[in-house]
């Protein structure tokens, strides 16, 4: 268990020409907020998954009044850190999303109003313990410069906050097979803690709170004999009073949703469904109203007024949740028209487009033959999104447009020589051969490979061919 | 609260220009890709143009290809609608509807009330 | 260009009444068939996005279904605030094309 520890140190225009307009003004004086959200790994899947180590959101700013005229400076910024606690072992890589919200505060009927300035994002190594990591992210013309840390949370130690650390039991050495904690030499690596009525004999355990079973032994505190014996259960062979298999702790068993969440298991772990009121990995975020600003990504919060009426956030489309924290799995509504394939970046959705379509969803049909002309007698032949003109005799390229060398491809056989014809090409035979393309050899005797040769056409003369 | 507001509208003759503004607020307007959709008189919707949120991807119907000039200044929260070479068939309402988050959908969300165009000498 | 092509042109119906409305592309469109309502004299409104997705704020009597070329908008049970005309929409292929209308009028 441990923090991640973010700083903001500012928010304001980044260099170069372009500066942004104060987000705030006389009329309008507003104040910063910010959301910090973290996955796991540096995966492409894991850039879209939800909050899976966490989020966070910060306090209000102060009330900032832009002076006229002035450009928009740094703009003034919550006090603290922002931290997002993580229970199980830090990953040592992980992606971030940082947002900066404006919220507005004039006369806005139904209260405030929010709205995304900035979001920055990322993907970073870091090793629990360490210094602070110094970064500076740009967002359009913003520039957002902060720092980062993961710390674990005694008696958590090492770069995963895996290793438990004890005051060491007597001044001169740990226990048997137990380390110093380095850089803690003074205390001593604790033994792992199972999860709670883990079986001391048939279970044991490589991260805290987990539950493992030695071969024969099942069940969520490894206290059930497996039987050979095979029975069906919903979620397989499996049964706690006939001693079948049954699977592993599944991630929602004991259900870890906070408040009414409903749990679904998802691939890497599982993931909490929040009753309108809560928010969090595990719904744990409560008394949240309109004023907190619980919708994400551009999400609309409506009533909530006070902490007992609950507030519903309208979700704007690509988004869902409860707070609109969740991202539609853009690439499962296979948005890239045509047959395109489709591409989810995380920070952005890319379409690959098939040949003849081009947009950014390869909604952009290359409209194959509408206003395009073959040059010289040649007719436009559409097709799947591309087009190609047939040409007349004696012209190719795209549009018909080039002068077609009837003799390039040395269409004469055995020898002939090729001359090119008003009509299309001529080939002049070698002794011995005959035919348009004096692909048939003339037999010894005088008869020709042909059932019979065109009427005043001796062999060896040229043929034009049509 | 989203809101778009049009403006620019009015009488013109065949053959003159004129230029439409459309005024985004109560969103991030640097986030979304905005459309001009109009609607002749008594009839239904026609779409004229679209742009992406950068303003990289800039798409034109072909009745006011070559005339017509979709822009946006993301500092000032606005669009424009140039339109050059107008013809009586141009008279309508036009409207500024903002795209969806991802163009995944292209679907026009939120609507402006609209700006009238009239063509005629 | 995709034709969409929408029936009826106009209904009536009373309040209460279900009231199904259709809307046929050229060709496939796959799911991206958005659904529109106007009021006279005002700007349309979204109300159905990607076949059968509902916009924020619009009320579950309103539902979408179909895929490919023929796609259905129904109300379940038709409000007094429902009388309005319905637009189809695609959003698959360029350039952006609506259905004609159909207009819901007052039985």
């Known amino acids: 268990a441990g923090v991640f520890e973010l700083q903001i140190h500012s928010f304001g225009p980044g260099p170069g020409p372009g500066a942004p307009r104060s987000p705030c003004s006389a009329r309008l004086p507003c104040r910063l907020f910010f959301r910090v959200c973290l996955k796991p790994g540096l995966s492409e899947e894991a850039a879209e998954s939800p909050c899976a180590l966490g989020a966070a959101l910060s306090a209000r700013g102060p009330v900032y009044t832009e002076q006229p005229g002035a450009p928009a400076p740094d703009l003034p910024l919550p006090d603290g850190l922002l931290q997002v606690p993580f229970r199980d072992a830090w990953p040592g890589t992980f992606s971030f999303i940082i947002e900066t919200w404006r919220e507005e505060l004039g006369d806005q009927i139904g209260g405030p109003a929010w709205s995304l300035l900035a979001r920055v994002a990322g993907r970073r190594r870091l090793a629990a313990g360490g210094p602070w990591a110094r970064d500076i992210q740009r967002a359009g013309a913003w520039e957002l410069r902060f720092s980062y840390r993961a710390r674990c949370e005694p008696p958590a130690v090492g770069t995963a906050c895996t290793r438990l650390c004890r005051p060491r039991s007597a001044p001169s050495r740990c226990g048997p097979g137990l380390r110093p904690c380095a850089p803690l030499e003074d205390e001593c690596e604790a033994p792992l803690v199972c999860r709670a009525g883990c079986s001391p004999e048939h279970g044991f355990c490589e991260q805290p709170g987990e539950c493992r079973c030695l071969e024969g032994w099942t069940g969520p505190l490894c206290t059930v004999p497996v039987s050979t014996s095979s029975c069906l259960s919903p979620r397989g062979p499996s049964s706690a009073t006939t001693g079948c298999l049954v699977p592993g702790p599944g991630p929602c068993d004991g259900n870890p949703c906070a408040n009414g969440g409903s749990c679904s298991e998802t691939p890497r772990s599982f993931e909490c469904t929040c009753p309108r009121g809560f928010y969090g990995l595990r719904c744990e975020v409560s008394g949240v109203t309109c004023a907190d600003g619980p919708c994400f990504n551009g999400g609309l919060c409506v009533g909530g007024a006070d902490p007992d009426s609950a507030y519903i956030c309208h979700c704007p489309p690509g988004f869902q949740g409860s707070n609109c924290e969740k991202r539609v799995d853009r690439c499962s509504l296979q948005p890239c028209r045509n047959g395109g394939l489709c591409l989810d970046l995380g920070h952005a959705l890319r379409c690959r487009c098939r040949a003849g379509f081009a947009g950014p969803r390869c909604e952009h049909d290359l409209d194959d033959c509408a206003g395009r002309a073959c040059a010289n007698g040649g007719t436009c032949v559409e097709g799947g999104g591309a087009h190609r003109c047939s040409c007349a005799l004696g012209f190719g390229g795209r549009d018909c447009r080039e002068r077609a060398d009837p003799c390039a491809a040395r269409p004469c056989a055995h020898g002939g020589r090729c001359y090119a014809h008003f009509s299309g090409l001529v080939c002049a035979c070698a002794p011995g051969y005959m035919g348009a393309r004096c692909e048939f050899p003339v037999h010894p005797d005088g008869a020709s490979a042909l059932p019979a040769a065109p009427p005043g056409l001796r062999p060896g003369d040229p043929q034009r061919y049509l | 609260e989203v809101q778009l507001v049009e403006s620019g509208g009015g009488l013109v003759q065949p053959g003159g220009s004129l230029r439409l503004s459309c005024a985004a607020s109560?969103?991030?307007?640097?986030?979304?890709?905005i459309h001009w959709v109009r609607q002749a008189p008594g009839k239904g919707l026609e779409w004229v143009a679209y742009?992406?949120?950068?303003?990289?991807?800039?798409y034109y119907a072909d009745t006011v290809k070559g005339r017509f000039t979709i822009s946006r200044d993301n500092a000032k929260n606005s669009l424009y609608l140039q339109m050059n070479s107008l013809r009586a068939e141009d008279t309508a309402v036009y409207y500024c509807?903002?795209?969806?988050?991802?163009?995944?959908?292209?679907?026009?969300?939120?609507w402006g009330q609209g700006t009238t165009v009239t063509v005629s000498s | 260009d995709i034709q969409m092509t929408q029936s009826p042109s106009s209904l009536s119906a009373s309040v209460g009444d279900r009231v199904t409305i259709t809307c046929r592309a050229s060709?496939?469109?796959?799911?991206?068939l958005n659904w529109y309502q106007q009021k006279p004299g005002k700007a349309p409104k979204l109300l159905i996005y990607?076949?059968?997705r509902l916009h924020s704020g619009v009320p579950s009597r309103f539902s979408g279904s179909g895929s490919g070329t023929d796609f259905t908008l129904t109300i379940s049970s038709l409000q007094p605030e429902d009388f309005a005309t319905y637009y189809c929409?695609?959003?698959?292929?360029?350039?952006?094309?609506f259905g004609g209308g159909t207009k819901v009028e007052i039985k």
């Open positions: 509807a903002r795209g969806d988050y991802d163009d995944i959908f292209y679907t026009m969300d939120y």
């Open positions: 109560g969103f991030t307007f640097s986030d979304y890709g």
């Open positions: 742009i992406s949120s950068g303003g990289y991807t800039i």
């Open positions: 060709r496939d469109i796959t799911k991206f």
């Open positions: 990607y076949t059968s």
């Open positions: 929409q695609q959003g698959n292929t360029l350039p952006w094309t």
